[in-house]
């Protein structure tokens, strides 16, 4: 939420955001450790499966949805719900899995149909002219990776990272969460621990690119495990 | 068209209360935070704080924190920005601000606040 | 806070001329900069953000480069109704800061 995000004194001077370790499968982020970053898991097994508390679709895996898990339920509670195929009932857009969107309640193919007045303005402004705007998109519902068919660039908003362009990921920057680079070999990255550890704060990172892990930098002056960098480095 | 109108302009002495308001039209209220902006006379811009009206949360900058409230009511898709108590230093024009990115790119046409005894 | 310093406080130069105005943040931003222009009497306009990206319908003699901590505003030809107050604004980190201005007028 915003109180905690954007109140908390812990994350008003992280680094730079310049990208970062394997973090949240679901958007491909990684965060600060010390701040819950509830989000959808899909790499669980359905045994050793969990669901993951959230409060918006944002925080849910590229093919989930946040909603109470029964209808009629509580609505203080709600998961990371797996998306709706084709044909299904929806009541927005992000209930639909990618390559869907939600027309008179029921999830249909982007590919269909012509988005025509907001959305079609959000495609157009935010990432068809690479003029990122406020007027005509909205940040739960139009930005959808599943209603536009060019890739956002650096900077341009986002809603997950299948929405941004080849080398960069969505992360979540202030009350947005906008394109940003893959982390290069020797950029500082986020490892985080087990389960749960997933930070929601200001400055998410992007994962390490391809062939790099998100390890302890190797240096003989640092004293404790704890303080240690973690930076990119070949596998 | 995203519009934001904010209330007319305020003459009010120290010590007493004010509550000025920022009416949106052309989108959606509750997709977009809204963030209240300072702007003294002749001085630089200073943000304030924002409101995620979609559920109420806030976030204030310290130098604000505790001497003015954000506010929004969905229901007539309009935030607030109020004081309890105005100095004569909160003399002042405050712009409204709507956005989902990292910038500010819709704004209102702010009120000014005149605070003297 | 992130201290953002504009240099010059004010210009003035003829239409048609090429403008620059610079930006300074007291810490490395990366990216995360934003140019507005305000005219007397109305709300500011975002005109650049990202560093480098035009808002929409913003002009394309309008122009923003730089990384880190300096960072640079073009008018690539200047016109009449370019005259205004210029701010930079950084955000990095919270709270967002805005430049002092620059005050841009007609020789």
């Known amino acids: 939420t915003l109180n905690s995000v954007l109140n908390s004194n812990a994350i008003k001077n992280l680094p730079p955001p310049l990208g970062g370790a394997a973090g949240h499968p679901g958007s491909a982020v990684s965060a600060a450790p010390g701040i819950l970053y509830p989000g959808g898991n899909k790499y669980q097994t359905i045994d050793n499966y969990q669901p993951y508390p959230c409060a918006e679709d944002e925080e849910c895996g590229t093919d989930e949805y946040c909603a109470s898990p029964t209808r009629g339920g509580d609505a203080g509670v709600q998961i990371c719900l797996a998306c709706r195929k084709r044909r299904k009932r929806c009541m927005r857009h992000a209930m639909c899995c990618p390559g869907n969107y939600c027309k008179n309640g029921i999830c249909v193919s982007s590919d269909q149909n012509h988005f025509r007045g907001e959305i079609e303005e959000t495609i157009t402004e935010s990432f068809g002219n690479d003029h990122s705007t406020l007027d005509g998109y909205s940040r739960r519902t139009t930005l959808s990776s599943k209603m536009y068919h060019t890739k956002g660039q650096e900077g341009s908003v986002c809603l997950r990272s299948s929405d941004c362009a080849s080398g960069l990921c969505c992360a979540r920057h202030f009350w947005s969460k906008i394109c940003k680079p893959v982390l290069k070999e020797g950029q500082v990255c986020t490892k985080h621990r087990r389960k749960g550890s997933h930070g929601l704060e200001i400055f998410q990172r992007c994962y390490c690119g391809e062939g790099l892990s998100c390890r302890i930098q190797k240096d003989h002056h640092q004293a404790s495990n704890s303080s240690r960098l973690h930076t990119c480095q070949r596998h | 068209e995203v519009q934001l109108l904010q209330s007319a302009a305020e003459v009010k002495r120290p010590g007493e209360s004010l509550r000025i308001s920022c009416k949106t039209s052309?989108?959606?209220?509750?997709?977009?935070?809204m963030h209240w902006v300072r702007q003294m006379p002749g001085k630089e811009l200073e943000w304030m704080g924002v409101i995620d009206p979609s559920n109420g949360d806030t976030s204030y900058n310290q130098k604000f924190k505790g001497h003015v409230t954000i506010s929004a009511d969905k229901s007539s898709s309009t935030a607030y920005l109020q004081w309890s108590s105005l100095k004569a230093s909160d003399a002042a024009m405050y712009y409204c601000s709507s956005t989902t990115g990292p910038w500010f790119a819709s704004w209102g046409q702010g009120t000014l606040v005149t605070v003297s005894s | 806070d992130i201290q953002m310093t504009q240099s010059p406080s004010s210009l003035s130069a003829s239409v048609g001329d090429r403008v620059t105005i610079t930006c300074r943040a007291s810490?490395?931003?990366?990216?995360?900069l934003n140019w507005y222009q305000q005219k007397p009497g109305k709300a500011p306009k975002l005109l650049i953000y990202?560093?480098?990206r035009l808002h929409s319908g913003v002009p394309s003699r309008f122009s923003g480069s730089g990384s880190g901590t300096d960072f640079t505003f073009t008018i690539s030809s200047l016109q009449p109704e370019d005259i205004a107050t210029y701010f930079c604004?950084?955000?990095?980190?919270?709270?967002?800061?805005f430049g002092q201005g620059t005050k841009l007028e007609i020789k």
């Open positions: 990202y560093k480098s």
């Open positions: 052309g989108y959606t209220f509750t997709e977009y935070t």
């Open positions: 604004q950084q955000v990095h980190t919270l709270p967002p800061t």
């Open positions: 810490q490395d931003i990366s990216n995360y």
